[in-house]
């Protein structure tokens, strides 16, 4: 009779992560008597996957009933496949021996490849805020996918970006892969409502790419513009001075009034108004008692925005002359007001 051959008909098998892999193996003869074992790999490190004779293999089931005397089908199923299960699997026939069974013949091996979906892309921006006209970097990461081929695109408000660099690791063969991409984005004053999107397409996603987003509101700082104006006289000896703080983001802002360099009042922006572009406006009033001053008064509106160095705008209040409306003529915007009479 012809010597037993171990046949593994499939050179390779491709399975999606989470599914069951079927590894086929048949013997051409019932002789010699002895068990079949399945291994992953060859040589000293080969890992026992299934032993017909003994052991506990919770993820492995046999395709046929191996207890039947005339059985020659030694195929197995491995459940809940993960990328870590990838490798070459060998079906090995042992000859019954004493005290130990002896390896008799091995199949040619079946390479199990695992298709695994990429994880949801995670987009992260710079640690510190940046101002318009500056270029900032965003990173996008996705892990655990297989095979290695993957496509990554960047968008800002639906417009595809071109200034980015992408790496897929590792470079060589692996059970699963990771992608890391860094995109450069130039900020504009209108970016408070903008979004940066990282889109990942992979064969396992069946044309439905995964997206990760970052809001530029977490990244941008729009510094305020200041305008100090003197309003018409309220009473014979009182002048109303306003400081318009316009187009700033984020809201965190502290305003200090100085009279001739001395702190008069400090307040925090609270009842702000929001512009269409997501920036904020705010207005603070200062009521100055002119009769309390013999000389001209230099009024300064000093603003500290989002922990940045203070910016200020000054206004000279003429005491000698009859107070009249002074200041710049920039178009007013919707503003909130905050009136405090300090006298």
């Amino acid at each position: 009779e012809e010597e037993l051959q171990v046949i593994q008909p499939d050179k390779s098998v491709l399975v999606a992560a989470g599914e069951t892999a079927t590894l086929r193996c048949t013997a051409t003869s019932l002789i010699p008597v002895g068990p079949i074992q399945w291994f992953r790999g060859a040589g000293p490190g080969r890992e026992l996957i299934y032993n017909q004779k003994e052991g506990h293999f919770p993820r492995v089931t046999t395709v046929s009933d191996l207890t039947k005397r005339n059985n020659m089908d030694f195929s197995i199923r491995i459940g809940n496949i993960t990328p870590a299960d990838a490798g070459t699997y060998y079906c090995v026939k042992f000859r019954k021996g004493s005290p130990d069974d002896v390896e008799f013949k091995s199949g040619a091996g079946t390479e199990l490849s695992v298709r695994a979906k990429p994880s949801a892309p995670v987009v992260s921006g710079p640690a510190a805020r940046a101002t318009p006209q500056h270029t900032v970097s965003f990173t996008c990461e996705s892990h655990g996918f297989s095979p290695r081929d993957i496509t990554l695109k960047w968008f800002k408000n639906g417009n595809e970006l071109s200034d980015f660099q992408t790496n897929v690791d590792p470079v060589g063969e692996s059970v699963s892969y990771s992608i890391h991409s860094t995109a450069k984005v130039v900020l504009t004053r209108e970016d408070v409502h903008s979004q940066v999107i990282c889109e990942v397409a992979h064969v396992t996603l069946q044309g439905d790419p995964l997206r990760g987003t970052a809001n530029l509101s977490e990244t941008i700082r729009v510094p305020p513009t200041l305008e100090v104006t003197q309003q018409p006289v309220r009473a014979e000896n009182q002048v109303n001075v306003t400081c318009q703080v316009r187009k700033f983001y984020p809201q965190r802002l502290q305003l200090t009034w100085l009279e001739n360099g001395n702190v008069s009042r400090t307040e925090t922006a609270s009842t702000v108004t929001e512009n269409k572009d997501g920036t904020y406006n705010w207005m603070s009033w200062l009521l100055v008692n002119v009769s309390a001053h013999r000389d001209d008064v230099k009024l300064t509106c000093q603003v500290e925005h989002d922990g940045q160095p203070a910016v200020s705008k000054s206004h000279d209040l003429k005491v000698s002359a009859h107070p009249k409306e002074q200041g710049s003529n920039t178009a007013a915007e919707n503003t909130g007001s905050n009136e405090r009479n300090i006298y």
Epitope: P44, G45, L48, G172
Partner: antibody, heavy 117, light 108 residues
Framework: DVQLVESGGGLVQPGGSLRLSCTAS????????MSWVRQAPGEGLEWVSA???????YYTDSVKGRFTISRDNSKNTLYLQMNSLRAEDTAIYYC???????????WGLGTLVTVSS | EIVLTQSPGTLSVSPGERVTLTCRAS??????IAWYQQKPGQAPRLLIY???SRATGIPGRFSGSGSGTEFTLTITSLQSEDFAVYYC??????????FGGGTKVEIK
């Protein structure tokens, strides 16, 4: 957590014998290849012997016929019986778990074998 | 037997520097190379396998590359804890499994 603990090292005269043990925990011992790797004082690493998940044994040429690797799966223990020891066998002997594609993913802290008269 | 030759034998570097270690095989090994780190008085620790796959828990500053007979281990920004001896090992041919002679990375 995978743990490998070697024991049995010591001082032995040339021509003498020693038996090293490695007790494993944290994984299904019977399913995996196990190996001995040694390191002579101030030298590099040298693979000595291995026992596969099926019990097949492998040796480097310099120890064939003198060293015997074995395992007791019921005790999760790997052994290395070393006979006809020579001065050049002096080394730290590490027990290591072998992955399915033949590299070493976990190592014990090692046991020192000194062969000297 | 596959012989692995590591170069240089010793490398003197400052923390923060980029380090590249080389391992050459006497024949093609199909990318089956592993890298280990060993600190004085400690057991080796697996860093890289299959030439470029990072082992569990290994920081991203360690990376492996190469194919055929020439392989490299790169440490992008050397930390104080990275000063050690680095060994390559081929896991292509198990008769026998072989290691390189090691590269010592020491403080400049």
């Amino acid at each position: 957590d995978v743990q490998l603990v070697e024991s049995g090292g010591g001082l032995v005269q040339p021509g003498g014998s020693l038996r090293l043990s490695c007790t494993a925990s944290g994984f299904t011992f019977r399913n995996y290849g196990m190996s001995w790797v040694r390191q002579a004082p101030g030298e590099g690493l040298e693979w000595v012997s291995a026992s596969s998940g099926s019990g097949s044994t492998y040796y480097t040429d310099s120890v064939k016929g003198r060293f015997t690797i074995s395992r007791d799966n019921s005790k999760n223990t790997l052994y290395l019986q070393m006979n006809s020891l020579r001065a050049e066998d002096t080394a730290i002997y590490y027990c290591a778990k072998v992955t399915w594609n033949n590299f070493f993913d976990y190592w014990g802290l090692g046991t020192l074998v000194t062969v000297s008269s | 037997e596959i012989v692995l030759t590591q170069s240089p034998g010793t490398l003197s570097v400052s923390p923060g520097e980029r380090v590249t270690l080389t391992c050459r095989a006497s024949q093609g090994i199909a990318g089956k190379i592993a890298w280990y780190q060993q600190k004085p008085g400690q057991a080796p620790r697996l860093l890289i396998y299959d030439a470029s796959s990072r082992a569990t828990g290994i920081p991203g500053r360690f990376s492996g590359s190469g194919s055929g007979t020439e392989f490299t281990l790169t440490i992008t920004s050397l930390q104080s804890e990275d000063f050690a001896v680095y060994y390559c090992q081929q896991h292509y041919d198990w008769s026998p499994l072989t290691f390189g002679g090691g590269t010592k990375v020491e403080i400049k």
